[in-house]
């Protein structure tokens, strides 16, 4: 459920990329959310998304337990006591091995029809 009363998230960025983990950063109004709901979905598979939640005061989290050299779509929503925001999504390719850790990857995040590319 989404409502106009709920302020939307700002943007989401993959700050660090490893072969089995990554670090996600996002912006959001201070004090607006109880928690953030994050889904990590391996692209092009029917495998269930990994769900996790992060306290509303945080703007960053590690996402461990990923596969190397794999495309993921990560979706984040802010949740209040009654509502969930429109989701923001980011697509990322994990590194193929230890040498590639933290190398820049092409990131795309979008909310609705807005698309931004970071290189």
């Amino acid at each position: 459920a989404s409502t106009g009363e709920t302020p939307n998230l700002g943007e989401v960025v993959v700050a660090e990329v490893g072969w089995d983990a990554l670090k996600l950063n996002w912006t959001a109004p201070e004090g607006a959310y109880e928690y953030f709901f994050i889904q990590v979905q391996e692209a092009d598979t029917v495998e269930a998304a990994q769900n996790l939640t992060v306290p509303g005061g945080l703007r960053s989290t590690d996402l461990p337990g990923l596969k190397a050299a794999t495309h993921y779509t990560i979706t984040i929503r802010g949740v209040t006591q009654d509502f969930s925001t429109t989701p923001l999504s980011v697509e990322v390719l994990t590194a193929s091995g230890l040498n590639d850790i933290f190398e820049a990857q092409k990131i795309e995040w979008h909310e609705g029809t807005h698309h931004h590319h970071h290189h």
Epitope: E34, N51, L52, P55, G65, V79
Partner: antibody, heavy 121, light 107 residues
């Protein structure tokens, strides 16, 4: 003060199903996850699965995948856990709980009183 | 699923002893790791959350530590009311997982 009140004890035949309810009161229901945890006699705690009512999607432990279904009715603030193809090893106390770390970051955990399910022919 | 391996499965100790229980995760986890105490016939009671934060109302003799894949619960000076079973719970990545439990008995 959040309260989780579970349905009463059940006696079931092997191969049948059981559905346990958990009614929440005293706080917001839809945004916070409800987990189901079971404990067989003399055994440890097992996390079976959980649901965030606002999203409706449940997560299940691999052990129970395909046999357990967790649902939530936002209109009555009630969560349900249905376990099918029951066997004697499913005899246990089943708890619903609001556990810190999964769509809930409150000062206290909240647990239902437990529902004893006995599977016997 | 992430496996949480808890050790020892049981231990005998005396009042005043220092006791440490360990939980190892099968992969790196976010530090959303809780420790619970359970007494027979009762629901579990949370002692520690976020790996090392002490639950309000819990005596300071209980402490948590660790990060990544290895976590510990320490009771600095065992008291008579501490004889119980202790469980770790990884609840930061779904599905969540409990450790197998550690029964602390009187020597």
């Amino acid at each position: 003060q959040v309260q989780l009140v579970q349905s009463g004890a059940e006696v079931k035949k092997p191969g049948s199903s059981v559905k346990v309810s958990c009614k929440a009161s005293g706080g917001t229901f839809s945004s916070y996850a409800i987990s189901w945890v079971r404990q067989a006699p003399g055994q440890g705690l097992e996390w079976m699965g959980g649901i965030i009512p606002i999203f409706g999607t449940a997560n299940y432990a691999q052990k129970f995948q395909g046999r357990v279904t967790i649902t939530a009715d936002k209109s009555t603030s009630t969560a349900y856990m249905e376990l099918s193809s029951l066997r004697s090893e499913d005899t246990a106390v089943y708890y619903c709980a609001r556990l810190y770390g999964y769509a809930y970051y409150g000062a206290f955990d909240y647990w239902g009183q437990g529902t004893t399910v006995t599977v016997s022919s | 699923d992430i496996q949480m391996t808890q050790s020892p499965s049981s231990l005998s100790a005396s009042v005043g002893d220092r006791v440490t229980i360990t939980c190892r995760a099968s992969q790196g986890i976010r530090n959303v790791l809780g420790w619970y105490q359970q007494k027979p016939g009762k629901a579990p009671k949370r002692l520690i959350y976020d790996a090392y934060s002490l639950q309000s109302g819990v005596p300071s003799r209980f402490s948590g530590g660790g990060s990544g894949t290895e976590f510990t619960l320490t009771i600095s000076s065992l008291q008579p009311e501490d004889f119980a079973t202790y469980y770790c719970l990884q609840n930061g990545l779904q599905p969540a997982t409990f450790g197998q439990g550690t029964k602390v008995e009187i020597k």
